[in-house]
């Protein structure tokens, strides 16, 4: 059980001096492990017993072992349920204290009742201030039972609960009808999950026989020892004024544990400290009685005397709870109260004994929880003791529980029980996670959940190429750190698995599920260079490049061309998906823009080195379109075009370009330059007779401008087939070749 104690200081004359302290004796700092364990929580639980709101209570932490609740201003602040929570993880435990008002109408004869499953529990509320009204019993705040006020027996109202089951556990109260709830008698009923002397999931295991009023925990079979006692079976008394599982804590104040109520983890509940009794734990035990609440009787033999804190103090030559055992009787020495082994290991367990006559190898035996008896394989005989060594067969989970070492000689016998915990090595429930990959390395997160028992002492990462029969490579890693697997093969699938270990021999768990992680392609290493480029219009650029010649196949899937427009801070990327390509046409560029251009080889998602950059200036966009283009047939081979100059020109026109195309024809259009920009008409000659033509035109300043509207016109008559159209402007008669 978790070493957690809730202390209530019951000096009730002054509520402001009242305090509750929760003390943890867990290893190291007392909250699960060390200072880093989960903090102790101490609070009033108002879910069942609600009291009028008052100033907030003050919580003070004293180091990591202890937390104290103060700031009670009036007696009603004290009434109700308080809880302390401590321990880490699965061991997180709640300890509960129920406080009754000393001035209440009804007072409990006994606040905490711990009973076994199937028992009959009897709660007894003593009349302190009589009222001639019915008494209402409640369970966890809900109505349960009513007693007529005449039904009091000997000044007490009794509630009998036959055949109790674990769900019956909780806070019970007895209240006079129409009286303040603060005047109720509050009880706590704890129902163990098993019948007397049994524990475990099916209640199949036998309790160790807790001494001195210790209570067997129904889940783990451990004895929860009363304050002031220690040991696997609570067999050992602490020095006066001490408590905690190892007697490591000391009661505050000069009067020791007087006036303190101690509450421990269920199924113990609460009691006075050893040597004290009474509703306020201020009365010393009567002669012949000892222990928590003075519930134990000494019955000392052979001249032993009764100490109210520890029980019988034996004279020389005698030992035992009642001084009933002679020192001649053999005695088990220094047996650990708890041992831990990993599943399927074959540990060696030692058991030492002394006595007169001296124990020999055959007189010491080891008994497992299932009753199997093991005989020692060897014994080491020393002057003061014999140590028997037992080789334990392969451990299974059912071996968890209480083992017993027993020594028998003609002088008598002794036995010592100890707990064996069989732990399951941890097994990852998930595969490690791939974070990033490169051609020769994988970055992996090995942080995985696991089944079985912690703590995790070692994390191993195993990996090898997929479908390989070669040995696994293994590295030991920190489970919360990203791990880089180095020197891998490119473009290769690797099977990666995690293996966890816990402390102790045989603590290595099975390997976790595999996951496939694939390394990236090899990086392309060749650096292209730009051979040349030329502008094919204000928004079109043709680029060509080369690669160095190297032996072997080309490592690459294609090329990436990048155009950086530094003015606008924009990048254009063009993917050329053939590794054989050495030229590309880039379209849709911004006219008049200064671009930085480079090209690089890519393979999978990896880019090779970029070519040295080139700087390219695209010509600016041209002027607006000529207006009102009109076509008029002059003969069977001539058509005259007329137009108006474009508006809002950015500069002087250098020429016009006319596009001629046979309507419905499949051939390429023909472009004819008009080199006299001042003209507004031209004659296109050499056309075919009776043929329909399409015309459009555009102006050029530094770059070609927008096209005009398209016009249609047919040549006249049925003349001879011409050699092809030519142009003649109004001011010049010479033709222009195509």
């Amino acid at each position: 059980a978790v070493d957690l104690t809730l202390l209530a200081n019951l000096r009730l004359t002054d509520p402001q001096r009242f305090f509750l302290t929760c003390v943890s004796g867990e290893a190291g700092a007392g909250r699960g492990s060390d200072a880093w364990g989960p903090p102790l929580l101490l609070e009033k639980d108002d879910r069942i017993v609600r009291t009028p709101p008052g100033p907030p209570l003050r919580l003070a932490r004293n180091g990591s072992h202890q937390v104290t609740l103060r700031g009670f201003s009036k007696p009603s602040d004290l009434v109700g349920v308080f809880s302390c929570v401590g321990g880490a993880g699965a061991r997180r435990t709640r300890v509960i204290y129920v406080h009754n008002s000393p001035g209440a109408h009804l007072l409990p004869d006994k606040v905490t009742h711990t009973v076994n499953k199937g028992d009959t529990a009897v709660l007894s509320a003593r009349v302190h201030k009589e009222k001639q009204t019915d008494v209402i019993w409640k369970s966890n705040g809900s109505y349960f039972y009513t007693l007529d006020w005449h039904e009091a027996q000997d000044g007490r109202f009794l509630l009998q609960l036959p055949n109790v089951q674990p769900p019956s556990s909780g806070i019970y109260s007895a209240t006079y009808l129409e009286a303040s709830p603060l005047g109720s008698a509050f009880f706590r009923l704890i129902v163990r999950g098993c019948g007397a002397g049994r524990w475990g999931p099916g209640c199949t295991k036998e309790c160790p026989g807790c001494l001195h009023g210790g209570v067997c925990h129904d889940h783990d079979g451990e004895c929860v020892c009363p304050p002031g006692f220690t040991g696997t079976r609570c067999e050992q008394a602490c020095r006066e004024g001490r408590f905690g599982q190892s007697c490591q804590e000391q009661c505050p104040g000069i009067s020791g544990c007087r006036g303190l109520t101690f509450c421990l983890p269920d199924p113990y509940g609460c009691s006075c400290g050893s040597g004290w009794r009474g509703s306020q734990c201020q009365e010393a035990c009567a002669p012949g009685h000892f222990g928590a609440d003075c519930r134990l009787q000494c019955q000392c033999q052979n001249g032993g005397t009764c100490d109210r804190f520890s029980g019988c103090v034996c004279p020389s030559g005698w030992h035992g709870v009642h001084c009933e055992k002679s020192d001649r009787i053999p005695q088990i020495l220094n047996m650990a109260s708890e041992l831990e082994f990993n599943l399927e290991t074959m540990p060696r367990i030692n058991c030492a004994a002394a006595g007169n006559p001296f124990p020999v190898r055959g007189s010491i035996e080891l008994r497992k929880p299932d009753g199997t008896v093991l005989l020692s394989t060897k014994a080491i005989v020393e002057p003061e003791k014999t140590t028997a060594e037992f080789e334990v067969p392969r451990l299974v989970l059912a071996d968890s529980g209480f083992w017993e070492c027993r020594v028998s000689t003609s002088g008598g016998q002794d036995s010592r029980r100890f707990k064996v915990n069989v732990k399951v090595p941890p097994v990852p429930l998930a595969a490690p996670r791939l974070l990033t990959k490169q051609s020769r390395q994988l970055v992996v997160s090995p942080l995985v959940s696991f089944s079985g028992d912690g703590p995790i002492s070692t994390v191993r990462l195993h990996y090898r190429p997929q479908d390989s029969t070669m040995d696994w490579s293994t590295i030991v890693v920190d489970p919360s750190e990203n791990v880089t697997l180095m020197n891998l093969r490119p473009k290769t699938g690797y099977s990666v698995r995690v293996q966890l270990s816990r402390p102790g021999e045989g603590g290595e768990g099975a390997w976790g599920p595999p996951t496939l992680m694939t390394t990236d392609c090899p990086e392309p290493l060749l650096q292209p260079w730009l051979e040349g480029w030329h502008v094919e219009g204000t928004d079109r650029l043709r680029v060509s490049w080369s690669l160095p010649l190297v032996p072997g196949p080309l490592v690459g899937d294609g090329f990436l061309l990048r155009l950086w427009d530094g003015t606008r801070g924009q990048e254009r990327r063009e993917n050329v998906s053939s590794p054989q390509a050495r030229t590309a046409l880039l379209t849709g560029l911004t006219p008049g823009t200064h671009y930085q251009l480079d090209v690089q080889l890519y393979h999978c998602t990896l880019l090779g080195p970029a070519s040295p950059p080139a700087h390219v200036l695209l010509p600016p966009s041209g002027p607006p379109a000529p207006r009102h283009l009109h076509a008029q047939a002059l003969s069977d081979s001539e058509i005259q075009l007329t137009w108006k100059h474009p508006e809002a020109l950015p500069g002087p026109i250098s020429k016009y370009v006319v596009e001629v195309q046979v309507a419905g024809g499949a051939g390429d259009p023909l472009w004819i330059d008009v080199d006299r920009p001042e003209e507004t008409s031209t004659i296109i000659r050499g056309l075919n007779a009776s043929t329909r033509y399409l015309f459009r035109m555009r102006a050029s300043i530094q770059g070609l401008g927008d096209w005009s509207n398209t016009v249609e016109e047919s040549t006249l008559g049925n003349g001879l087939q011409a050699e092809g159209p030519v142009q003649e402007s109004r001011a010049a008669e010479e033709g222009l070749d195509q």
Epitope: A27, G28, A29, S33, D34, A35, W36, P38, P39, R61, G63, S64, H65, S445, L447, P455, I456, D478, P479, S480, E481, N482
Partner: antibody
Framework: EVQLLESGGGLVQPGGSLRLSCAAS????????MNWVRQAPGKGLEWVSG????????YYADSVKGRFTISRDNSKNTLYLQMNSLRAEDTATYYC????????????WGQGTMVTVSS | DIQMTQSPATLSLSPGERATLSCRAS??????LAWYQQKPGQAPRLLIY???NRATGIPARFSGSGSGTDFTLTISSLEPEDFAVYYC?????????FGGGTKVEIK
């Protein structure tokens, strides 16, 4: 690379405020308890504050309680220390330190950032 | 608070010699004690945890011992790079506390 990088130090007047940051990289930041440890010039180490991986539990040294606030942003892999009501005795190099995953000590430290409180 | 006291404050030794550093706690800290090494201008480095376990990558010449209140860090044969300041630290109780440090200098 597994590392911690502090920033935000500098010169501040007594009574002033400063916010230190610690950027973590190369490990699962959200799985670790993180701490601030300081070292006055020519003096020894003093633990200042610690915060659990989820931020649910926080601890302070008595010397800074009520003045300093530790916090973390796991989505940004960053630890913070908000320092208010600064005093001359807070002058120190402030280290961000990671608690080993088994809790046994501080296994990763930053290079530190200097805080000087002076008028 | 748990006070951690280190002695001596300074230890003057030559390379190759054995160094023994002591750390005492004002109350029991079980085995929850760590040792750190700090060189000038650098952050501390974890050497030993839980009183006697070497941290990852720490050479075997460093060893720790003790439990409860008395602890020792031993450097079996000093190397030139071992001259530094060494701190002990407890994690048994809040607040976590460091010792005042022992400076190991070249004689």
């Amino acid at each position: 690379e597994v590392q911690l990088l502090e920033s935000g130090g500098g010169l501040v007047q007594p009574g002033g405020s400063l916010r230190l940051s610690c950027a973590a990289s190369g490990f699962t930041f959200s799985a670790y308890v993180m701490n601030w440890v300081r070292q006055a010039p020519g003096k020894g180490l003093e633990w200042v504050s610690g915060i659990y991986s989820s931020g649910g539990y926080i601890y302070y040294a008595d010397s800074v309680k009520g003045r300093f606030t530790i916090s973390r942003d796991n989505s940004k892999n960053t630890l913070y220390l908000q320092m208010n009501s600064l005093r001359a005795e807070d002058t120190a190099t402030y280290y961000c330190a990671r608690r080993h995953f088994n809790g046994v000590g501080f296994d990763l430290w930053g290079q530190g950032t200097m805080v000087t409180v002076s008028s | 608070d748990i006070q951690m006291t280190q002695s001596p404050a300074t230890l003057s030794l030559s390379p190759g010699e054995r160094a023994t550093l002591s750390c005492r706690a004002s109350q029991s800290v079980s085995s929850y004690l760590a040792w750190y090494q700090q060189k000038p201008g650098q952050a501390p480095r974890l050497l030993i945890y839980d009183a006697s376990n070497r941290a990852t990558g720490i050479p075997a010449r460093f060893s720790g011992s003790g439990s409860g209140t008395d602890f020792t860090l031993t450097i079996s044969s000093l190397e030139p790079e071992d001259f530094a300041v060494y701190y002990c630290q407890q994690r048994s109780n809040w607040p976590l506390t460091f010792g005042g440090g022992t400076k190991v200098e070249i004689k």
